[in-house]
């Protein structure tokens, strides 16, 4: 699998899309997981509704949401209030039994807010009362990693 890069701005929302063959993956739930190290396991962040018929419902785990267009064949993940620690390698997965097929490998990059002149360590976190409806969803910038590019920094 090639790795697709999605870039988002700190403090804003990032939308990641994972296209797939809707017939091949018919009846399968989907998941979004975070790769723990280059050879490590992929830790589940959020998955679609247990009832495949209701895969279109947006399900949240913390600041991450997932929703599946099972007819169009597009899995969409939203990372709300993007933070530097959200950067890293992820996977969109199609689940069947205890197995998981990788739909897409995704590298999330977090860019500093160009309008934020404060220190990088002094990022704004929205209060609990602020709803997602008020948030501005940035169109993500995506590209595929070039051959030889390493999604993980080399470990010493």
């Amino acid at each position: 699998h090639n790795t697709t890069v999605f870039q988002g701005v700190a403090g804003q929302s990032l939308q990641v899309s994972c296209p797939y063959d809707s017939m091949k993956h018919w009846g399968r739930r989907k998941a979004w997981c975070r790769q723990l190290g280059e050879k490590g396991p992929c830790q589940r962040v959020v998955s679609t509704h247990n009832l495949w018929l209701l895969s279109f419902l947006r399900r949240w785990n913390g600041s991450t949401a997932i929703t599946d267009d099972t007819l169009g064949g597009t899995l969409t993940i939203t990372l709300r209030n993007l933070q530097p620690h959200d950067a890293g390698l992820y996977q969109c997965q199609s689940l069947h039994g205890s197995e998981a097929d990788t739909l897409r490998k995704v590298l999330v990059e977090v860019l500093a807010d160009p309008l934020d002149h404060r220190d990088a360590g002094d990022l704004w976190f929205p209060g609990e009362s602020e709803s997602f409806e008020d948030a501005h969803v940035e169109h993500s910038i995506s590209r595929s990693l070039l051959e030889g590019e390493i999604p993980f920094p080399p470990t010493s």
Epitope: N50, W52, L53, L54, F56, L57, R58, R59, T67, T76
Partner: antibody, heavy 124, light 107 residues
Framework: QVQLVQSGAEVKKPGASVKVSCKAS????????MHWVRQAPGQGLEWMGI????????SYAQKFQGRVTMTRDTSTSTVYMELSSLRSEDTAVYYC?????????????????WGKGTTVTVSS | DIQMTQSPSSLSASVGDRVTITCRAS??????LNWYQQKPGKAPKLLIY???SLQSGVPSRFSGSGSGTDFTLTISSLQPEDFATYYC?????????FGGGTKVEIK
Amino acid sequence: QVQLVQSGAEVKKPGASVKVSCKASGYTFTSYYMHWVRQAPGQGLEWMGIINPSGGSTSYAQKFQGRVTMTRDTSTSTVYMELSSLRSEDTAVYYCARGPGYTTALDYYYMDVWGKGTTVTVSS
Amino acid sequence: DIQMTQSPSSLSASVGDRVTITCRASQSINSYLNWYQQKPGKAPKLLIYAASSLQSGVPSRFSGSGSGTDFTLTISSLQPEDFATYYCQQSDDDPFTFGGGTKVEIK
């Protein structure tokens, strides 16, 4: 107006099967899912499963797997729920209830229109 | 399965009273929580969906709040037609599950 009309009361013997119908009117039948919920005498509500009238796909609560079958007839805008191997504990009022159908990125899910219910009595 | 626990199971109140019913989920269900009203011999009626959204045609004296695991249904000023049983229901997970119900009786 939107309406779900259910079939009449049934009395069945243990081990038999029952088939309850629910006829929809006043809306586009294939645009909404249909759920079945039952209520034993003096008890609470219990969700049994869901059917997509558009394609006929179903999903049943684990408790009823192997005993329940939900089908639909798009020509008459009717859904059916068949429960087999009946026992006395299946004595209940069975409701069909409409829920939002396939859409994109919905942040809520409910059952907004209900049938009046069909009483099923299982007795020897 | 997600367990939905309602309290109290019954309460007595007078017309004009403010009534509060609580519902607790055994795990987070975000805001996938609905409230239904049921009168004897009748089908349930949707009052509140998505924890706090009022269903069309439902009087504004009904309101809902909460997210995660703890939810509340409030009737600001109880009317004679509100004496009924109220159920919460989660739709975040399979199977959908209901609370045991709260019967609101006349004092």
